[in-house]
């Protein structure tokens, strides 16, 4: 049968049952995923918008697939095996009374079973297994997978020791706290910082430690994945996003019509095929574009390149370069340059590096 061909799997709770507090639903689903991640190399991340691998839905009766629910009792839930689209999705019958305890139907226990299906497991003939086809309440505080459940899931994915870094051929969600993590582009958007990687972005809100991962397509469906450079002009509520030789303009978080446009409209020579990184400095009202080992400076008021560019990055940004992946401006005096898994806090008034950090240091890793 099918399996997920990646170890980082996203899930999203589409809607919430009124039977329980939202936090209790979140907790039950998170703990249910944890049951499976504890015995496999799989890692699960909750996303709040966009297309997740596994969508969790509460619904009654006919609800968008061939398998209409049957009212209270009978079928409690069903889940689709791994795959695109509806693949992996778990549907819970809203006509059941969902609970955190032994009354009604326990959401955690049902979710453990359904997520087993979402991961590719069929039913077990062992009555002690969570994958046994009939529901039976057990104490959730002492709940454990049976040997049969563990054997089944490890036959599909291996055991947790096999969690060595996999390449990322399918743009599965990168591990945020992987010390080797690098970013494609980074920019501020108001009081938030957007970190772009593959088809994902992380959102860091000012000083709060919490970050959330989202799909680029969930916020901006018309934009591509693999954004390569980004910068913000906060006074205009504008964000510019670059990929290959094109750029998109986002105003007030909405994509402007008639984009993408060619990067050559900024005045780049024809040999420039893509931008590695970009940053706007509101003090000088200039945008710095980094391309390979050089950079250009663009006057946002006059809408033209400043004369005398390009210049070498290493010559004018001491200790930075020769190439960079991403950069953003913060706190009125710093550029944060990203090179691979390393990040450099650069004071542009003193013109020197003031701190060396890991690229993911913003996430409390």
């Amino acid at each position: 049968g099918p399996v997920w061909r990646k170890h980082y799997i996203t899930y999203r709770i589409n809607n919430y049952t009124p039977d329980m507090n939202r936090e209790d639903v979140d907790y039950a689903i998170r703990k249910a995923f944890q049951v499976w991640s504890n015995v496999t190399p799989l890692k699960f991340s909750k996303i709040n918008t966009g297309m997740a691998d596994i969508l969790v839905v509460f619904a009654r009766g006919a609800h968008g697939d061939f398998h209409a629910f049957d009212g209270k009792g009978g079928i409690l839930a069903h889940a689709f095996g791994p795959g695109s689209g509806i693949g992996g999705d778990a549907h819970f019958d809203e006509d059941e009374f969902w609970t955190t305890h032994s009354g009604g139907t326990n959401l955690f226990l049902t979710a453990v079973h359904e997520i087993g299906h979402s991961l590719g497991l069929g039913h077990s003939s062992d009555p002690k297994a969570v994958m046994f086809p009939t529901y039976k309440y057990v104490d959730i505080n002492t709940f454990r997978l049976s040997a049969d459940d563990i054997r089944g899931i490890q036959s599909l994915y291996g055991d947790p020791k096999e969690n060595q870094r996999l390449p990322n051929p399918d743009n599965s969600e990168p591990a945020l706290c992987d010390p080797n993590l690098s970013f494609d582009a980074v920019t501020t958007v108001g009081n938030k910082i957007f970190f772009f990687k593959d088809r994902f972005f992380w959102l860091k809100v000012s000083e709060r430690p919490k970050t959330s991962v989202n799909l680029i397509s969930s916020l901006w469906p018309t934009l591509p994945s693999g954004i390569e450079a980004a910068y913000e002009i906060e006074a205009r509520n504008q964000v510019f996003l670059f990929k290959d030789d094109k750029y998109w303009l986002i105003s007030n978080l909405r994509p402007e019509p008639n984009y993408p446009k060619s990067i050559h409209s900024f005045g780049f020579p024809n040999f420039v095929k893509k931008i590695d990184a970009a940053v706007f400095n509101p003090r000088f009202y200039r945008t710095y574009f980094f391309v390979d080992n050089q950079y250009w400076r663009y006057d946002e008021r006059r809408q033209m390149m400043d004369p005398g560019y390009p210049k070498l990055i290493t010559k004018n940004f001491q200790g930075i370069g020769p190439k960079i992946d991403a950069v953003f401006y913060s706190k009125n005096k710093y550029y944060y340059f990203f090179q691979g898994s390393n990040q450099f806090e650069y004071d542009f008034l003193l013109q020197r590096i003031t701190k060396t950090l890991k690229s993911n240091s913003w996430f409390g890793c």
Epitope: D65, H78, I86
Partner: antibody, heavy 122, light 103 residues
Framework: EVQLLESGGGLVQPGGSLRLSCAAS????????MHWVRQAPGKGLEWVSG????????FYADSIKGRFTISRDNSKNTLYLQMNSLRAEDTAVYYC???????????????WGRGTLVTVSS | DIQMTQSPSSLSASVGDRVTITCRAN??????LNWYQQKPGKAPELLIY???SLQSGVPSRFSGSGSGTDFTLTISSLQPEDFATYYC?????FGQGTKLEIK
């Protein structure tokens, strides 16, 4: 290469019967849900029936319930539609279509046959 | 029961035009919506699945969006081979179809 080839269509009188077949090749037939979809002349598509990987469960559109029976023979890689008590409004091109692999049908029809024409007329 | 309403039923456009077809469900179907293209005398072909995922081999000028009850299929720049009938579909329910004709 995935191929679905329907056969068994033809002219039949109202009240008559017909059995359509769909021969599958180029993929492992047994784990997939399979469906029949029809299209009356000059009209849109109408889903008719679907069947699970091992011959069950089966689903039917209300318009044909009790008259048509879907079945499959995994050893022959073949899907069938037994059509009884045929009516003029059953006149259509009948397509077989492949759904996803697994315990539940999604209705994501990624491969279709070319269709076979059934004409119900006196 | 779930019903799908597709609009418009027919549409005239020229090569190079941007075209949008909409499909509305009478209740939430999450992102469980597919789009098919059918040319005269041929079987339908899957274009977009799960509302916005492009089926392998389908040109990138086709895109889909939406979730819940409202969905759109967009062709960014019409090509001569795109003149056909388009259907939205969810499980056992198809929209009525949109015939795209040359202006």
């Amino acid at each position: 290469e995935v191929q679905l080839l329907e056969s068994g269509g033809g002219l039949v009188q109202p009240g008559g019967s017909l059995r359509l077949s769909c021969a599958a090749s180029g993929f492992t037939f047994s784990p997939y849900w399979m469906h029949w979809v029809r299209q009356a002349p000059g009209k849109g598509l109408e889903w008719v029936s679907g069947i699970g990987p091992s011959g069950g469960p089966t689903f039917y559109a209300d318009s044909i319930k009790g008259r048509f029976t879907i079945s499959r023979d995994n050893s022959k890689n073949t899907l069938y539609l037994q059509m009884n008590s045929l009516r003029a409004e059953d006149t259509a091109v009948y397509y077989c279509a492949r759904d996803i692999w697994g315990a539940y049908a999604s209705g994501l029809f990624d491969y279709w046959g070319r269709g076979t024409l059934v004409t119900v007329s006196s | 029961d779930i019903q799908m309403t597709q609009s418009p039923s027919s549409l005239s456009a020229s090569v190079g035009d941007r075209v949008t077809i909409t499909c509305r469900a009478n209740q939430s179907i999450y992102t469980y919506l597919n789009w098919y293209q059918q040319k005269p005398g041929k079987a339908p072909e899957l274009l977009i699945y799960a509302a916005s995922s492009l089926q392998s081999g389908v040109p990138s000028r086709f895109s889909g969006s939406g979730s819940g009850t409202d969905f759109t299929l967009t062709i960014s720049s019409l090509q001569p081979e795109d003149f056909a009938t388009y259907y939205c579909q969810q499980a056992g329910i198809f929209g009525q179809g949109t015939k795209l004709e040359i202006k």
